[in-house]
Interface confidence: medium
Amino acid sequence: MRTEAQVPALQPPEPGLEGAMGHRTLVLPWVLLTLCVTAGTPEVWVQVRMEATELSSFTIRCGFLGSGSISLVTVSWGGPNGAGGTTLAVLHPERGIRQWAPARQARWETQSSISLILEGSGASSPCANTTFCCKFASFPEGSWEACGSLPPSSDPGLSAPPTPAPILRADLAGILGVSGVLLFGCVYLLHLLRRHKHRPAPRLQPSRTSPQAPRARAWAPSQASQAALHVPYATINTSCRPATLDTAHPHGGPSWWASLPTHAAHRPQGPAAWASTPIPARGSFVSVENGLYAQAGERPPHTGPGLTLFPDPRGPRAMEGPLGVR
């Protein structure tokens, strides 16, 4: 969901109250407060659906809940893409879609979500203890990955308990740096607020004379995110046959969607909202990375600091690939 938060303009303090230093110390807390409030953690959700008609066929759907623009999506199986997983599909908003068997059809559903149909046959059916992972590379958040596993289960539809923190790869120097600054800023803000606790509060009102205040991009967490308190770790457990409605979804919706945990099964907000589809679990892995494309199996040319492109030298193209033009 994309929202915008407006930083309120500050009425200058009365002369003699705190002087120039006072003005700085009053502006800073509000700027930092805005940053702290608007720096929402992005999330990746994963849904795994088993086709009722074809029990060895699965649909994986993934979405990104964040305010950044998505530059690449990688779907892999067997674990996260850089840690033993192998790529099933790579979707680039401009460069096209690449997919590998047994992926049958990968496509964009919205600007921030994708779906992938996976066909299994006999021994290679994806039921065989397979973990599916979706990684979204976005700017400025970096790479976020969530995974859901499909172990064989004799109890279809029952949700697996959240798994203890499996991976959080913190090699995202730039973004972690920003996070560090924000964290420091928030701590400093608390310190300033404590210092100003016993002082008269400054009068805050929108400035009528000054130009519009700077606008900060913000990500407003969905109800589900707030309800789940950002517990990011849950495995998606399905079996090789459709689950029954009552065991799978006390909240309703199609019975074959594996959406866990149930406490997070609210409707998604914004672009990821589909009719009668509960919001899925946070994946069983969440990872943050900097080499946005490197982990997707691309080895792009060096294109300047922090900018990586697919190795197509001819510039941006329309969505093309084996599945046709979007």
């Epitope: 199986w77 067997g78 192998t86 068997a101 047994p102 290679s124 084996p322």
Partner: antibody, heavy 120, light 107 residues
Framework: EVQLQQSGPEPVKPGASVKISCKAS????????IHWVRQSHGKSLEWIGY????????GYNQKFKSKATLTVDSSSSTAYMELRSLTSEDSAVYYC?????????????WGQGTSVTVSS | DIQMTQSPASLSASVGETVTITCRAS??????LAWYQQKQGKSPQLLVY???TLAEGVPSRFSGSGSGTQFSLKINSLQPEDFGSYYC?????????FGGGTKLETK
Amino acid sequence: EVQLQQSGPEPVKPGASVKISCKASGYTFTDYNIHWVRQSHGKSLEWIGYIYPYNGGAGYNQKFKSKATLTVDSSSSTAYMELRSLTSEDSAVYYCAREELRRDYGMDYWGQGTSVTVSS
Amino acid sequence: DIQMTQSPASLSASVGETVTITCRASENIYSYLAWYQQKQGKSPQLLVYNAKTLAEGVPSRFSGSGSGTQFSLKINSLQPEDFGSYYCQHHYGTPYTFGGGTKLETK
């Protein structure tokens, strides 16, 4: 040294099945996909499918989906391809080859090939 | 499936000459193309991947170029060991397909 050692030549009768092996050494078996490629006498190469040793997941060329079954035994770093309902059309040299998981390096090492001859 | 069309099917050349083999994809495969060399009775060997990156140990007289649907493999100053068959293969996604091959023979 990376090596893919394939099983020996297989003379088989029409309608029978055959299982050929590809033993990998010199690298971490689960870090690479194993692909299978067919080459009929004097012809080009045809991709049959691949298997991902990490979890045994396989992907097939539709043309070979009912003909070939790919499996792995990670404990012995060996990949297998079973060919069934063989006909004279299936007489060919079958190669295994490895490819880095992210599939952008090409098939960099190949087995020596297994010749399958179907004749009554 | 993506079709790969290679030309010429056969080619005669002498040691020291420069030859070019071309490969055309039936649809855009960006730079996801590999070239292989195969000598009589031997397994194929990777020469080039991602259209222009030389595989490890491949002599610099080999070079790949192209993107989209048109690709070529150029061999400068042919050496005796370069004679054999050459195949292009897309790695844009499965099913992988190979070109029909180019047989490079001595003149």
